[in-house]
């Protein structure tokens, strides 16, 4: 009759398939992102509460604070599963963590691939987002700062051109618009003037009423969509690095959780085996 498998004699009853290194590496790895997620939620909530009353009118879909809260909450729940699952050696929580992380990774991968394959549709979506942001420019301070930063960074104005600012009710260029900003563009569209120490926030006033040639003496006339697309094309390696930077922690998390799940399963098998054969004279 063949001998039954048994635990290595050296470690006796204390032997475990669960590696403390894997277990605590996964725990601290999740703990780090758990803390980050809480900070994200806290910053998001703070930003949302600190906004003016009229921010309630803002389009939530483009609100960076809401985006921060949503991502933070999802990250919190995910890393919570990872933390508790690794600490308590809970297969159910670890499998949930692993599956969710895999799903997130695959979604990101799919978005990236689809973005390249359907670049025209991706461009259309970017246009839609930018135009929506233009419409809500004055409704949300965070969004306003983001647009101003983008226009200054990429030396551009509007989506396709500076005249896109007419989509905003304050900057609308119809002759009966009562707004003092009628036909204007934000100061972030203005060309830098080295001689001016203080930014002239009125420099974009009435600029939509001028043609490209005249407006280009004062403001950026090129839209931000083309500038953004050109920037993406010329920074593909950088974007690839960022994508890799996001993918590596996810892949590490998936790998560690799967290793730990397999180790826990082996440990359970060992415990069941030991329970079944305690009375075995061969043991």
């Amino acid at each position: 009759m063949a001998r039954r498998p048994r635990a290595p004699a050296a470690s006796g009853e204390e032997f475990s398939f669960v590696s403390p290194l894997v277990k605590y590496l996964l725990f601290f790895f999740n703990m780090l992102f758990w803390v980050i997620s809480m900070v994200m939620v806290a910053v998001g909530v703070y930003a949302r509460l600190m906004k003016h009353a009229e921010a309630a009118l803002a389009c939530l879909a483009v609100d960076p604070a809401i985006l921060l809260i949503v991502v933070g909450v999802l990250m919190f729940l995910l890393t919570f599963c990872g933390c508790i699952g690794s600490l308590r050696e809970n297969i159910c929580l670890l499998q949930t963590f692993s599956l969710c992380l895999t799903a997130v990774f695959l979604l990101q991968l799919a978005a990236g691939i689809l973005g390249f394959v359907f670049s025209d549709k991706a461009r259309g979506k970017v246009s839609e987002i930018i135009n929506n942001a233009i419409v809500h420019y004055r409704d949300d301070l965070d969004l306003q700062n983001l647009i101003d930063f983008g226009q200054k960074k990429f030396s551009c104005c509007g989506g396709i051109s500076y005249k896109d600012w007419s989509q905003n009710m304050y900057f609308n260029c119809s002759e009966d618009n009562p707004s003092r900003e009628r036909c204007s563009v934000p100061y972030s569209c203005c060309l830098p003037t080295p001689d001016q120490a203080v930014i002239n926030t009125m420099c974009g006033q009435g600029m939509q009423a001028f043609d490209y040639l005249e407006a280009s003496k004062v403001i950026y006339t090129n839209g931000c969509i083309d500038k953004l697309v050109n920037w993406i094309h010329s920074n593909l390696f950088l974007l690839g690095g960022v994508a890799l930077g996001l993918a590596i922690p996810q892949l590490v998390g998936i790998l560690l959780s799967q290793i730990l799940v397999n180790q826990i399963k082996d440990q359970i098998k060992l415990q069941l085996y030991n329970q079944q054969h305690r009375a075995d004279p061969w043991y």
Partner: antibody, heavy 120, light 107 residues
Framework: EVKLVESGGGLVQPGGSLSLSCAAS????????MTWVRQPPGKALEWLVF??????????EYSASVKGRFTISRDNSQSILYLQMNALRAEDSATYYC???????????WGQGTTLTVSS | EIQMIQTTSSLTASLGDRVTISCRAS??????LNWYQQKPDGTIKLLIY???RLHSGVPSRFSGSGSGTDYSLTISNLEQEDIATYFC?????????FGGGTKLEIK
């Protein structure tokens, strides 16, 4: 350099008709609203009509004093603005100016003016 | 329609003087106020738009101020070439309307 040159003024009998022209240069004509403003001798300026730009479908807006009698039009291929005046009255006697009108509500460039006299 | 009133129809000043021309609107025009200069030969030029912004090529001695219904044009150091009639105009609503004008003469 933006330049506007009016022509076509003269002496007309009451009830008569006349067409004024304004040749524009130095800017993208289709991108701008164009307008006519008049000034009777020794009096203030009076806005008459404007025609919107390409983006706004070249639609028109008239003052109550000339609506139904005057017609504004533009030849975008030649950058010329027109004002067709019918059923002229003695009170229409004035210097007629063509100007570039901005949606911000100002007339940033003006022509030198052309004089219309309505008299029998 | 909005009425534009220039109470002073003519003004006499000496060269080098600081001259202020005023204009009043019949309702709030939210700073959509422009100033024009008409020379004796009939030529018209935009001087100031949106209350205080100098049009390109206009000397810095010209300045504008005001809000609501009351606005003014100031010439800080009157020169011979400034002898003209000055008109204010509101661009807040259609129809755009002009003031009666202020004729500036030399003493």
């Amino acid at each position: 350099e933006v330049k506007l040159v009016e022509s076509g003024g003269g002496l007309v009998q009451p009830g008569g008709s006349l067409s004024l022209s304004c040749a524009a240069s130095g800017f993208t004509f289709t991108d701008y609203y164009m307008t006519w403003v008049r000034q009777p001798p020794g009096k203030a300026l009076e806005w008459l009509v404007f025609i919107r730009n390409k983006a706004n479908g070249y639609t028109t807006e008239y003052s109550a004093s000339v609506k139904g009698r005057f017609t504004i039009s533009r030849d975008n291929s030649q950058s010329i603005l027109y004002l067709q005046m019918n059923a002229l009255r003695a009170e229409d006697s004035a210097t007629y100016y063509c100007a570039r009108y901005l949606q911000t509500g100002n007339f940033d460039y003006w022509g030198q003016g052309t004089t219309l006299t309505v008299s029998s | 329609e909005i009425q534009m009133i220039q109470t002073t129809s003519s003004l006499t000043a000496s060269l080098g003087d600081r001259v202020t021309i005023s204009c009043r609107a019949s309702q709030d025009i939210s700073n959509f106020l422009n100033w024009y200069q008409q020379k004796p030969d009939g030529t018209i030029k935009l001087l100031i738009y949106f209350t205080s912004r100098l049009h390109s090529g206009v000397p810095s001695r010209f300045s504008g101020s005001g809000s609501g219904t009351d606005y003014s044009l100031t010439i800080s150091n009157l020169e011979q070439e400034d002898i003209a009639t000055y008109f204010c105009q509101q661009g807040y609503t259609v129809p755009p309307t002009f003031g009666g004008g202020t004729k500036l003469e030399i003493k």
